[in-house]
């Protein structure tokens, strides 16, 4: 009997209700390998998910995120809300980056500006919420009264991703 089932190709299942003949997978289900006793139900891309690849009898559907969201996790297991540059997503929604931090993407957390003085350099361009500072030549290479290094970023809580 096991041999009968092993003959069932991908896209079918070994149907115990029908003397172990190979039956096609029901609608919206698939089997990606041969010899299966059940077909797996296709993933449904709903809510904040949209279909990137339709399910077939031999492969699962693949999901993407609708506009305003981005994928998180393997195979886009979750969608997280986009924020603007200069913001990060917290449990209470999108919040502006604290002074001394920046985020140049629509996702992720605000990160501290580069501390130019650690590399013995000076600040050439000040940082903003959206952009990191640009470090220039070391202060020794500059005339007296030149821009000094940026202060270290203030302590802050890391960003949170909603469930």
């Amino acid at each position: 009997l096991q041999d009968l089932c092993s003959n069932c190709p991908a896209g079918t299942f070994c149907d115990n209700n029908r003397s172990q003949i190979c039956s096609p997978c029901p609608p919206n289900s698939f089997s990606s390998a041969g010899g299966q006793r059940t077909c797996d139900i296709c993933r449904q891309c709903k809510g904040v998910f949209k279909t990137r690849k339709e399910c077939s009898s031999t492969s699962n559907a693949e999901c993407d995120c609708i506009s305003g969201y981005h994928c998180l996790g393997a195979e886009c297991s979750m969608c997280e809300q986009d924020c603007k540059q200069g913001q990060e997503l917290t449990k209470k929604g999108c919040k502006d980056c604290c002074f001394g931090t920046f985020n140049d993407q629509k996702r992720g957390i605000c990160r501290p500006w580069t501390n130019c003085s650690l590399d013995g350099k000076s600040v050439l361009v000040n940082g903003t919420k959206e952009r990191d500072v640009v470090c220039g030549p070391s202060p020794a290479d500059l005339s007296p009264g030149a821009s000094s290094a940026t202060p270290p970023a203030p302590a802050r809580e890391p960003g949170h991703s909603p469930q």
Partner: antibody, heavy 118, light 112 residues
Framework: QVQLQESGPGLVKPSETLSLTCTVS????????WSWIRQPPGKGLEWIGY???????NYNPSLKSRVTISVDTSKNQFSLKLSSVTAADTAVYYC????????????WGQGTLVTVSS | EIVMTQSPLSLPVTPGEPASISCRSS???????????LDWYLQKPGQSPQLLIY???NRASGVPDRFSGSGSGTDFTLKISRVEAEDVGVYYC?????????FGQGTKLEIK
């Protein structure tokens, strides 16, 4: 054929944390959502939450403050922790393979009864 | 959350006769992809629930063809064309459109 098996203490004291593990055999834990569902004696079914094999989670809002679900892909296991339990948490706890992240529970464990009592 | 309501709660049936269970949701389960996100489960005595029907009307692989699901939007029906002794247990409908998924109270099918 995928099989799921719940394990953990059958008796938990009030205010303590309930801990259960689900071991998946006959298939990989990868590429699916994995849910916990419970059923108080003589009552209906309540979804607790799910985890994706990569670690993404989603919990029932009614239990969210007390629930943690985690996954160990190396052992093909996922786990449930429910804190500050009361007698109302006495139930048969099932683990299940969730095909869509909150829908179509195609494979279930046999369930394990957890009683909350001092 | 979406509330699911089943009727009847108890259903005595003679073997060989048909049976029908109704399930109503507090909001439409018809999604823009054209599918109704509703499942039916059977929990036989002392066992775990088993999936019978998904997406409103699709029989899970291996489920006998005497089981069928129908309906759309907020009103759904599970039909058993000829009840057999092995069909006894509690039948649950479940909405799978929104998190958290929610179940009906259950319908207990028993043999007369």
């Amino acid at each position: 054929q995928v099989q799921l098996q719940e394990s953990g203490p059958g008796l938990v004291k009030p205010s303590e944390t309930l801990s259960l593990t689900c071991t998946v055999s006959g298939g990989s834990i990868s590429s699916y959502y994995w849910s916990w569902i419970r059923q108080p004696p003589g009552k209906g079914l309540e979804w607790i939450g799910y985890i994706y094999y990569s670690g993404s989670t989603n919990y029932n809002p009614s239990l969210k403050s007390r629930v943690t679900i985690s996954v160990d892909t190396s052992k093909n296991q996922f786990s449930l922790k429910l804190s500050s339990v009361t007698a109302a948490d006495t139930a048969v706890y099932y683990c299940a393979r969730d095909q869509s992240g909150g829908g179509s529970f195609q494979h279930w464990g046999q369930g394990t009864l957890v009683t909350v009592s001092s | 959350e979406i509330v699911m309501t089943q009727s009847p709660l108890s259903l005595p049936v003679t073997p060989g006769e048909p049976a029908s269970i109704s399930c109503r949701s507090s909001q439409s389960l018809l999604y823009s992809n054209g599918y109704n996100h509703l499942d039916w489960y059977l929990q036989k005595p002392g066992q775990s629930p088993q999936l019978l029907i998904y997406l409103g009307s699709n029989r899970a692989s291996g489920v006998p063809d005497r089981f069928s699901g129908s309906g759309s939007g907020t009103d759904f029906t599970l039909k058993i064309s000829r009840v057999e002794a092995e069909d006894v247990g509690v039948y649950y409908c479940m909405q799978a459109l929104q998190t958290p998924p929610t179940f009906g109270q259950g319908t207990k099918l028993e043999i007369k």
